[in-house]
Interface confidence: medium
């Protein structure tokens, strides 16, 4: 149904009084500068707010910051700046919040020029207390927590030293010099690149990749001639310079760098780049940039070893290294990703895949929308989604697409309906089935957020004028109510709700401006009284994900299995609650050719599910590098898609014979690796 407040919309009873009783204003005794907000822990209600204000003086910039803490989801704040000795905190480092529910926080302070090292403030009790610690180095990066042990921290210094702490920043030790990049791996392992001849920039392509599994007691060189490295899922990737020229190739390891295989991906030149778009324990999406300044490249999807890649999408929009791509993982439905392609006429179009990159299609035109001026045929067009690229181009798009794992099937995004993305003012669209179908939800650009696992959607109009109205929907965006949360409009700067979309609180941030001053202000609205009762069994309905034809036996089969979910009925106005767990029921599907990707040396012609041999490889033995050995591949062209759980059906057989010969093209063979101890 069309959005709005028509007769069909069941209004929430007495909502104004209910929300008025649950609206909490907090005015910050602060000059307006910048504000950053962090949630500490999950379901703790603890929020830290750091406000900073720079006063440009003639000779130098004088800075002032204040730290505030809330323990009731933002309804009340307490000024705790005295806990950090009224020190100016460096906002570029942000607030380093510990993993999981560790309750750990690290703030990095600004120190005067002549000091020996930096200063941090540490808390391990959800910011109730802080300990000041002077560092033996000046940090270059934010402190990084080990995902496995929040007491272990690493940081790079301005002198390119790699520093590690084993007691949550109390004591620090420099474990290596000349370090360019360092990352935590699994099991408290640290991977880092080092330079030999002067600087990271000068040695790019000649870096060494090192590993320590014991926080710096011993080291192993696991790669040479390294340009860069990255971690994704269970894969370690290194981009390695070729012997003969300036090209480089991706090598991959699944055993923390002990053995490497060359990924079957195109090599790239100096001006090109690789980018890991998404990775999990099953597979990886890899973008390979095209030669020249084209602004696009190709997406490849990997097999389960990260070695064999299938071409997934051509002309994938990705501007420059570290630039903008619209690639988005739709977390509310398994296997769904959205991104943009740059078509031959330089227009940008949105594509969606429902099967983890197997096939890409245009987004279906919303039923309640007309095709815009970009459409050649007014009856045939599709929805195009605005994401990072549109935001970078300063289009009137305040937010990227939004989805949440526990709000099953819901995707909210700005978009336009035509043959390509339009520069006109976008509207907001919603899908309740993971991107298969879309409906216009709100006219014009908005900020939006999901509360109570999808039970409530909240939106605020994006406007240059001050605002005092919030919109909310209890039926997945079909119908909207408006609530005036303050008499005095504020200049809106952002919506904040607890990550994970389980909360029923939303904070509206902004500032008030008067003749003399401007101040930060937040309004926190608790929707608990709108959703008066807890949801019961009758409030949920069975929904088959990826369903396109409910009668069809294979309907809903994606990656070898289908999933039934219990979804909240749109008509039910009730609380899923903070402890809500998505109820899903998987069942195995029969294997079809769609459950297999094409093996090395094979490809799928367009609109065909069969894999055929690449013409240039016909009749040749297929040989490729695996763990530094040359392998002979006997295959009928198929390999099971990573994460696919199908059984029975078709079963293409596959066999790999080890030729026991060394790969001449593998620069990361084990012989070139060495170890040393401190």
């Amino acid at each position: 149904s069309a959005p709005g407040e028509d007769e069909e919309c069941g209004r929430v009873r007495d909502f104004v009084a209910k929300l008025a009783n649950n609206t909490h204003q907090h005015v910050f005794d602060d000059l307006r500068g910048s504000v950053s907000l962090s949630w500490v822990g999950d379901s703790t209600g603890v929020i830290l707010v750091l406000t900073t204000f720079h006063v440009p003086l003639v000779i130098m910039t004088f800075g002032q910051s204040k730290l505030y803490r809330s323990e009731d989801y933002g309804k009340n704040f307490k000024d705790i700046t005295d806990l950090i000795n009224n020190t100016f905190i460096r906002t570029e480092f942000g607030m380093a919040i510990g993993p999981e529910n560790s309750g750990k926080v690290v703030l990095t302070a600004e120190v005067s020029g002549g000091s020996r090292g930096g200063r941090i403030f540490r808390s391990s009790d959800f910011a109730k207390n802080f300990v000041q610690t002077d560092l033996p180095f000046h940090p270059l990066t934010q402190m990084m927590y080990s995902p496995q042990n929040s007491d272990y921290l690493l940081a790079l210094s301005t002198e390119n030293g790699l520093w590690v702490s084993k007691n949550f920043g109390g004591k620090w030790e420099e474990i290596h010099k000349a370090v360019c990049l360092a990352k935590w791996g699994s099991d408290n392992t640290i991977f880092f690149t080092t330079y030999a001849n002067g600087s990271c920039k000068a040695d790019l392509g000649a870096l060494e990749l090192w590993r320590t599994s014991d926080l710096g007691k011993s080291f192993k060189t696991i790669g040479v001639k390294i340009y860069s490295f990255g971690l994704g899922g269970r894969f370690l990737f290194a981009s390695v310079m070729a012997d003969k020229d300036t090209t480089r190739r991706i090598h991959v390891s699944t055993d923390q760098g002990d053995t490497w295989s060359m990924a079957q991906l195109p090599s790239v030149g100096q001006e090109q780049f690789y980018s890991i778009l998404a990775a999990n324990d099953d597979m990886v999406f890899m973008h390979v940039d095209e030669p020249g300044d084209t602004g696009f490249g190709t997406i490849f999807t990997s097999d389960d070893r990260g070695i064999v890649y299938s071409k997934s999408l051509d002309r994938h929009l990705y501007t420059t290294t570290g630039g903008e791509t619209d690639f988005t993982n739709v977390t509310s439905l398994r296997g769904v990703y959205i991104t943009s392609v740059l078509s031959e006429d330089n227009s940008i179009q949105t594509m969606i895949t429902f099967d983890q990159g197997g096939r890409w299609t245009h987004l279906r035109k919303p039923e309640n929308s007309e095709c815009d001026a970009t459409a050649k045929n007014k009856n045939e067009c599709s929805l195009h989604i605005h994401a990072s690229y549109s935001i970078s181009q300063k289009l009137n798009v305040p937010m990227a697409p939004l989805s949440e794992p526990n709000a099953v099937g819901i995707v909210i995004a700005h978009g336009s309906v035509g043959d390509a993305i339009s520069v006109m003012v976008p509207d907001v669209y919603i899908s309740d089935d993971g991107g298969y179908s879309w409906t216009k939800m709100l006219e014009g650009p908005h900020y939006y957020t999901i509360l109570d696992s999808g039970g409530i959607i909240v939106a605020i109009e994006h406007s240059s004028r001050p605002i005092n109205v919030i919109k909310f929907s209890t039926d997945e965006g079909q119908c909207w109510q408006t609530y005036t949360f303050t008499r005095d409009p504020i200049y809106f700067t952002g919506l904040a709700s607890e990550p994970g979309a389980r909360s029923m609180n939303i904070s509206i941030w902004g500032f008030t401006e008067s003749f003399l001053t401007s101040q930060w202000v937040s309004y926190t609205i608790d929707f608990k009284d709108i959703l008066e009762r807890n949801c019961e069994e009758k409030d949920y309905t069975i929904w088959l994900a990826h369903s396109t034809d409910p009668e069809d036996y294979e309907d809903g089969c994606i990656l070898g299995y289908k999933e039934q979910f219990l979804r909240l009925r749109k008509s039910s106005v009730c609380q899923n609650g903070r402890d809500y767990v998505v109820t899903k029921q998987p069942s195995i599907c029969l294997c079809s050719l769609e459950d297999f990707l094409c093996d090395f040396g094979y490809y799928r012609p367009e609109n065909d599910s069969k894999c055929v041999e690449q013409p240039e490889l016909k009749g040749h033995d297929l040989e490729f590098c695996l763990y530094g050995r040359e392998e002979h591949l006997t295959t009928n062209g198929y390999r099971k898609i990573p994460g696919d759980k199908c059984q029975g059906g078709v079963n293409p057989v596959r066999e790999v014979k080890d030729l026991k010969k060394k790969c001449t093209s593998n620069f990361l063979s084990p012989e070139k690796q060495n170890s040393k101890s401190n």
Partner: antibody, heavy 118, light 107 residues
Framework: EVQLLESGGGLVQPGGSLRLSCAAS????????MSWVRQAPGKGLEWVAI????????YYSDTVKGRFTISRDNSKNTLYLQMNSLRAEDTAVYYC???????????WGQGTLVTVSS | DIQMTQSPSSVSASVGDRVTITCHAS??????IGWLQQKPGKAFKGLIY???NLKDGVPSRFSGSGSGADFTLTISSLQPEDFATYFC?????????FGQGTKVEKR
Amino acid sequence: EVQLLESGGGLVQPGGSLRLSCAASGFTFSTYGMSWVRQAPGKGLEWVAIISSGGSYTYYSDTVKGRFTISRDNSKNTLYLQMNSLRAEDTAVYYCSRSSSHWYFDVWGQGTLVTVSS
Amino acid sequence: DIQMTQSPSSVSASVGDRVTITCHASQGISSNIGWLQQKPGKAFKGLIYHGTNLKDGVPSRFSGSGSGADFTLTISSLQPEDFATYFCVQYAQFPYTFGQGTKVEKR
């Protein structure tokens, strides 16, 4: 009315062959997965084989794999089970049943008796 | 293969009684279970799918519960036409497997 009607059962010697048919009516046959299930005298139900709605994909229980072939002709709304190398333990009433993406084994035929004996 | 253990194998009951039949799966099957009814000389009939969902046209006195490995079929008030044999079936994984059946007979 939704109906399934099996035929083709009878007495056959060990090592012999038989082809069962299941005629469907009252629903869109081509969109449903179809199964064969059997019940030996005095025993429980045993699922035998399934075929996908388009007919491209099949799955068999280990006890019949390599000997039985499930197939379908959507133009004739008919499901088949070709049984070769029959054994005494294949003696049972054979039922055909339909499955959709939501429903498994919701509609059944009356069954046809297959007796394997010398 | 997943084994489905159904109990009891038979139950004697009178019209109006509450009858409960259980099925235990040898491993977790989420809610991928159906319940079937077989009357002598009649075709099998599907009653419940996905553990708890009543097939259209099935009286509301039939209900299903459970998730994971333990499931129950309940007939809240037995009617004359309910004397039959009931089977559970799992369809979480191939090969699909059935319970041994529970015969509900007149006391």
